[in-house]
Amino acid sequence: VPGEAEQPAPELVEVEVGSTALLKCGLSQSQGNLSHVDWFSVHKEKRTLIFRVRQGQGQSEPGEYEQRLSLQDRGATLALTQVTPQDERIFLCQGKRPRSQEYRIQLRVYKAPEEPNIQVNPLGIPVNSKEPEEVATCVGRNGYPIPQVIWYKNGRPLKEEKNRVHIQSSQTVESSGLYTLQSILKAQLVKEDKDAQFYCELNYRLPSGNHMKESREVTVPVFYPTEKVWLEVEPVGMLKEGDRVEIRCLADGNPPPHFSISKGNPSTREAEEETTNDNGVLVLEPARKEHSGRYECQAWNLDTMISLLSEPQELLVNYVSDVRVSPAAPERQEGSSLTLTCEAESSQDLEFQWLREETDQVLERGPVLQLHDLKREAGGGYRCVASVPSIPGLNRTQLVKLAIFGPPWMAFKERKVWVKENMVLNLSCEASGHPRPTISWNVNGTASEGDQDPQRVLSTLNVLVTPELLETGVECTASNDLGKNTSILFLELVNLTTLTPDSNTTTGLSTSTASPHTRANSTSTERKLPEPESRG
């Protein structure tokens, strides 16, 4: 109507999807009687009657709002339940008397989108792409109104930048009226972006104010050419023969290039390619001194066939050569002297030690061992150990056996053996001397002889226990060019009272052994007299 005052701005009512909107008719008593009101929805400038109030009683009109409207607050407020995005429109109430006035309410509807779903480019991005390449996508589902997306790199928001950063977004309306926002970040990346963290953020509004949701952070596979190639050796530090050594070729490109490792040949002055495993690693196991030398790595870009060469790396596999001892097989008379000399080569300074084989006692620190006034007991093993003190575990040894000339020397002079009549007895007798003695027995039986070492012999006799044998006992005699010596084994019948409580009669009585080693090595439990210390 010309001259009529401009309509006031509608009252704003904000509500979340699914909740109830309370539409309060703001007509004053002078503007109309609230017991007689018509409610309309306005959509695309078209009014539709949705609710009538008569004498304070409400009545829904047929249509989309029929089931969702009710009166509250003594008829002054219309409640709209289960609000949907389609309800975002103007509602107006119109009083009937004294003259027709209306009050307008703008309903604004909100819904937080779901957590943003970020997906990174699974194939990666080369740094030399001609234009911005797709880095990641972000999807925010079921929000209202359309949320805003912001992309971040390392915590900083990304802005559109010509030929560098491009953000492309679109939205679709679901059947529910909610929006799904889709966004793709395109960017030209550089090598430094290989560790960059990207994420997307959705900004949206609710009746309570502005809010945001962030996606998880992702990193993008970034491909960049190799600029530098180098070799790494494991283990680090001093290497020694016998170690497992890995020579690995490394490059700063992604994906790694194809590698080959070569070793310089000092005689031909040419590099010879080494055989690497599937990962391009050269494994030396066990490492030998021949593996020492100059290694280098060549990296090939199979796309461009450009190759890069690493700095050469010297590999030193430390070693100790075979140890030589002179004299190699020493023989001496009792009372004489002997000088043993030890030699070896190494890539490092060597230390020598002489040890007695039987006791591991250190006799000398140095390559020369001098022995004076040699006794029979001096016969046996001497070990020279050549070691590199700076490299634990790098050592070699050589054993030399010293023989002292002398007549046979018995392990025992006499011994008592408990037996049972008619049992088969296993007797043993041990003697040493140089030259090596032979052993004979004074009774018939099955004898077998075995060398313990070049100067020592052990003879075993299987014999049936007879009354005559019990009476005479058994003698073993050892002889060599320098003399002879005898041991006597006295046989004594066992009875139950002579057996110890822990005896095992079956084994004890069937395999009696008359050897000085019985205590340590035999399962025999026959009782023995204490061993005499005399050595004949």
Partner: antibody, heavy 118, light 106 residues
Framework: QVTLKESGPVLVKPTETLTLTCTVS????????VSWVRQPPGKALEWIAA???????YYNSAFKSRLSISRDTSKSQVVLTMTNMDPVDTATYYC????????????WGQGTLVTVSS | DIQMTQSPSSLSASVGDRVTINCKAS??????LAWYQQKPGKAPKVLIF???SLQTGIPSRFSGSGSGTDFTLTISSLQPEDFATYYC????????FGQGTKLEIK
């Protein structure tokens, strides 16, 4: 509507080179990437190669040295070449469009069966 | 490379049945997973993307769930046209497909 159609030889000899063409319509190769996926008879799907909307090429490392993928945006075509063909390469070869806002394949060609035999 | 293992490799069911197909990734792929349906002599058709989003035009009886390494495709009430082979595919690092699950009529 979006369509993709594969074309190329149905039979190739061992050691020969296979060239397949994917002709697309209903979208632009500068807005969607295209992949090649193959399926040997009675077996599973296997991704071979891709070209992005920006023109970047990607290959399955199992075949990389034998593959080449390229495109002609004016003809709306993507071309795959695979050298040194072997009977184990006998398969149905599909081209597929990558969804613009995701990394899955939303449209596929009907596929072309390539047999490698002497 | 990420391996995708589907189970079962085949299953028999009747119209109206509720069916689940499982897919296991050899490492965490978050929700970078799609499900495809393939009928004999036809190209695959995407059903589900981002592990649980239904592709436009796909009936709501299809649903996807899971995250990380374990994923499931569920068909709530089998229809005659659903008998086919189903593949899962990861797109977290490169592209790899499961070996397929053949769904047959009992």
């Amino acid at each position: 509507q979006v369509t993709l159609k594969e074309s190329g030889p149905v039979l190739v000899k061992p050691t020969e080179t296979l060239t397949l063409t994917c002709t697309v319509s209903g979208f632009s190769l500068t807005s969607n990437g295209v992949s090649w996926v193959r399926q040997p008879p009675g077996k599973a799907l296997e991704w071979i190669a891709a070209i992005s909307s920006g023109g970047t090429t990607y290959y399955n490392s199992a075949f990389k040295s034998r593959l080449s993928i390229s495109r002609d945006t004016s003809k709306s075509q993507v071309v795959l070449t695979m050298t040194n063909m072997d009977p184990v390469d006998t398969a149905t070869y599909y081209c597929a469009r990558r969804y613009g806002y995701g990394w899955y394949f939303d449209f596929w060609g009907q596929g072309t069966l390539v047999t490698v035999s002497s | 490379d990420i391996q995708m293992t589907q189970s079962p490799s085949s299953l028999s069911a009747s119209v109206g049945d509720r069916v689940t197909i499982n897919c296991k990734a050899s490492q965490n792929i978050y929700n970078s997973l799609a499900w495809y349906q393939q009928k004999p002599g036809k190209a695959p058709k995407v059903l589900i993307f981002n592990a649980n989003s239904l592709q436009t035009g796909i009936p709501s009886r299809f649903s996807g769930s899971g995250s990380g390494t374990d994923f499931t495709l569920t068909i709530s009430s089998l229809q005659p046209e659903d008998f086919a082979t189903y593949y899962c595919q990861q797109f977290y690092s490169g592209y790899t497909f499961g070996q397929g699950t053949k769904l047959e009529i009992k």
